[in-house]
Interface confidence: medium
């Protein structure tokens, strides 16, 4: 319904801390190299006009949108052009085109300093002096860093760090308490920010009707026996919520979103038997728990879906009166029957059913014709199985940094165009499948892995379009979203690249190495690894292992050394000299 | 559009029995909650009882006991067999489906007139 003030309705429903922390989220990821101060600062102002409308709702402004509240605040900042450049263009518009504005100017690979955690001591200190600031800094630091991190879910992890060091800042080893739960949070949050911007990519570059029939598929899963009309309106919601969060409306987004969870909370009966024990938490933590629900028991006397779907003599009839019903209905009565095929499977299947009856609907026998399309699935369904199998068994024998950098080679062959930094990044984050998905049982296994993969591509996909580098990855990533995964797979060396120069400075390592934490290590190797490649792009296996296995024991002789500095700026040389030869 | 089609209404005596069918496309009514809903001269369109895919059925208080709704997913029809009928039955009854993603579907409803 309307309101004559949306923002006063915004704050009444979700409360004077949980406002503060989405008008937070929402400045750091428009203006992402503004201080935390200036930040928050605008969100007091915001907040306190907020209660001003709660208390009037007539008062002067209270009848503006969100949108035009929050950019005539961002574009009252003093010096934006000077910080922002061409984003200050922005504000010449008027509202919808202003925060259209503002949304293409989010920058996914911002220039900011990886986050840092402070040291144990230090960080219960400054926790326990002021927790509303330390957790405010939370939000901003990780908002900004993560311009599409879905803001209610953010909200969550903030409450979980808040519980951590609560529970942390006591114990007499506060390090040892905090780290392993620390990381188990920052993993957990980094796997949500690469697949919220997949959904984010999803609905901007193929509409809601994309987005839809991936929830669809989604849903269908997790609640095999909740009727079509029941998973239709909850994916219809999701959809909603997350184009208010791609969109920028977190106020809209967070409040829909708890919405949702009272709504499924209430009708569990037609939706999950599963959902009881998420319905006692309270509200951040019961949509966390909601989205995250196991599949429900799947129903024991489901029909064989070619009933409907080939052998009723009504297909074409029935697909050309209701598409959009028919294939909605296919979609959910396969995928109901499969939680142990990943989304974007299911997406192919039905792209690939609804193909079949386009050609086949138009033919003199449409039944002989798409009579085998069942059978037709078989090797859309065996490519990714046995893509998992061998990457899984691959994994098992290399573990992860071994495997992260079987995959560094595999993808700089691939797009050996593409910047060493985001092949690195890519890499690593691919080769954490194996440890995300491999050690899982096996029906869930391929679910896993491909959509965590599709995940990762699509940030690949976001990075590249910024500074477009190679045709290959180009090709992939303007397809389909649900083909990407398979196209990155299909790509094998690229034929047309020329080797980069051998650059001896490139392959030159100093004592600071040796001081660096493990994953920095892990990093600065994979990044010659990635280099040696660009260098000699059809080198064997065999040499790569020899080259690498030659740098490590130097970098573990030279770290070991009495001078450090002495034995890098003589042995360095050497191993150069070394690498080049077996690389010849 | 979905197409349902209503079928065995009737001109019957107070205390009789009709049984009415509604038949539309298979993967349509397995998947979907199945309902009728009756129209009176002069009155509101009110639910009657539905069925859903799980077998769970509900029924309006007025009918409760007297009427029973029930599917066969083989010939892609849903019924409603209605006993002891009272001319406070009299009314148009309809078919309906809810799709996702259209409109609502329903039938053309047929006549069903209960004499005293």
């Known amino acids: 319904e309307a309101h004559k003030s949306e923002i006063a309705h915004r704050f009444k429903d979700l409360g004077e801390q949980h406002f503060k922390g989405l008008v937070l989220i929402a400045f750091s990821q428009y203006l992402q190299k503004c201080p935390y101060e200036e930040h928050i600062k605008l969100v007091q102002e915001v907040t306190d006009f907020a209660k001003t409308c709660v208390a009037d709702e007539n008062a002067e402004n209270c009848d503006k949108s969100i949108h035009t509240l929050f950019g005539d605040k961002l574009c009252a900042i003093p010096k934006l052009r000077d910080n922002y450049g061409e984003l200050a263009d922005c504000c010449a518009k008027q509202e919808p085109e202003r925060n259209e504005c503002f949304l293409q100017h989010k920058d996914d690979n911002p220039n900011l300093p990886p986050f840092q955690r402070p040291e144990a001591e230090a960080m219960c200190t400054s926790f326990q002096e002021n927790p509303t600031s330390f957790l405010g800094h939370y939000l901003h630091e990780v908002a900004r860093r993560h311009p599409y991190f879905y803001a209610p879910e953010l909200l969550y992890y903030a409450e979980k760090y808040n519980e951590v060091l609560t529970q942390c800042c006591t114990e007499s080893d506060k390090a040892a308490c905090l780290t392993p739960k620390l990381d188990a949070v920052k993993e957990k949050a980094l796997v949500a920010a690469v697949r919220q911007r997949m959904k984010c990519s999803s609905m901007q570059r193929f509409g809601e009707r994309a987005f839809k029939a991936w929830a669809v598929a989604r849903m269908s899963q997790r609640f095999p026996n909740a009727e079509f009309a029941e998973i239709t309106k909850l994916a219809t919601d999701v959809t909603k919520i997350n184009k208010e969060c791609c969109h920028g409306d977190l106020l809209e987004c967070a409040d829909d979103r708890a919405e949702l969870a009272k709504y499924m909370c209430e009708n569990q009966a037609t939706i999950s038997s599963k959902l009881q024990a998420c319905c006692d938490k309270p509200v951040l933590q019961k949509s966390q728990c909601l989205a995250e629900i196991e599949h429900d028991n799947i129903p024991a006397d489901l029909p064989s879906i070619a009933a409907d779907f080939v052998e009723d003599k009504e297909v074409c009839k029935n697909y050309a009166e209701a598409k959009d019903v028919f294939l909605g209905t296919f979609l959910y009565e396969y995928s109901r029957r499969h939680p142990d095929y990943s989304v974007s499977l299911l997406l192919r299947l039905a792209k690939k059913y609804e193909a079949t009856l386009e050609k086949c609907c138009a033919e003199g026998d449409p039944p002989a014709c798409y009579g085998t399309v069942l059978a037709e699935f078989q090797p859309l369904v065996e490519e990714p199985k046995n893509l998992v199998k061998t990457n899984c068994e691959l994994y098992e024998k290399l573990g992860e940094y071994g495997f992260q950098n079987a995959v560094l080679v595999r993808y700089t062959q691939k797009a050996p165009q593409v910047s060493t930094p985001t092949l690195v990044e890519a890499a690593r984050n691919l080769g954490r499948v194996g440890t995300k998905c491999c050690t899982l049982p096996e029906a869930q296994r391929l679910p896993c892995v491909e959509d965590y993969l599709s995940a990762i591509l699509n940030r690949l996909c976001v990075l590249h379009e910024k500074t477009p580098v190679s045709e290959k990855v180009t090709k992939c990533c303007s397809g389909s979203l649900v083909e990407r995964r398979p196209c990155f797979s299909a790509l094998t060396v690229d034929e047309t690249y020329v080797p980069k120069e051998f650059k001896a400075e490139t392959f030159t390592f100093h004592s600071d190495i040796c001081t660096l934490p493990d994953k920095e290590k892990q990093i600065k190797k994979q990044t010659a690894l990635a280099e040696l490649v660009k260098h000699k792009p059809k080198a064997t296996e065999d040499q790569l292992k020899t080259v690498m296995g030659d740098f490590a024991q130097f970098v573990d002789k030279c770290c070991k050394a009495a001078d450090k500095d002495n034995c890098f700026a003589t042995e360095g040389p050497n191993l150069v000299a070394r690498s080049k030869e077996a690389l010849a | 559009q979905v197409k349902l089609e209503e079928s065995g209404g009737g001109l019957v005596q107070a205390g009789g029995s009709l049984r009415l069918s509604c038949v539309g496309p298979?993967?349509?009514?397995?998947?979907?909650?199945m309902g009728w809903y009756r129209q009176a001269p002069g009155k509101e369109r009110e639910l009657v009882a539905f069925i859903r895919p799980s077998g769970l059925t509900n029924y309006n208080d007025a009918v409760q006991g007297r009427f029973t709704i029930s599917r066969d997913n083989a010939k892609n029809t849903v019924y409603l067999q209605m006993n002891a009928l009272k001319p406070e039955d009299t009314a148009v009854y309809y078919c309906?489906?809810?799709?996702?993603?259209?409109?609502?579907?329903w039938g053309q409803g047929t006549q069903v007139t209960v004499s005293s």
């Open positions: 309906h489906t809810r799709p996702p993603f259209q409109r609502d579907s």
């Open positions: 298979g993967f349509l009514l397995r998947s979907n909650t």
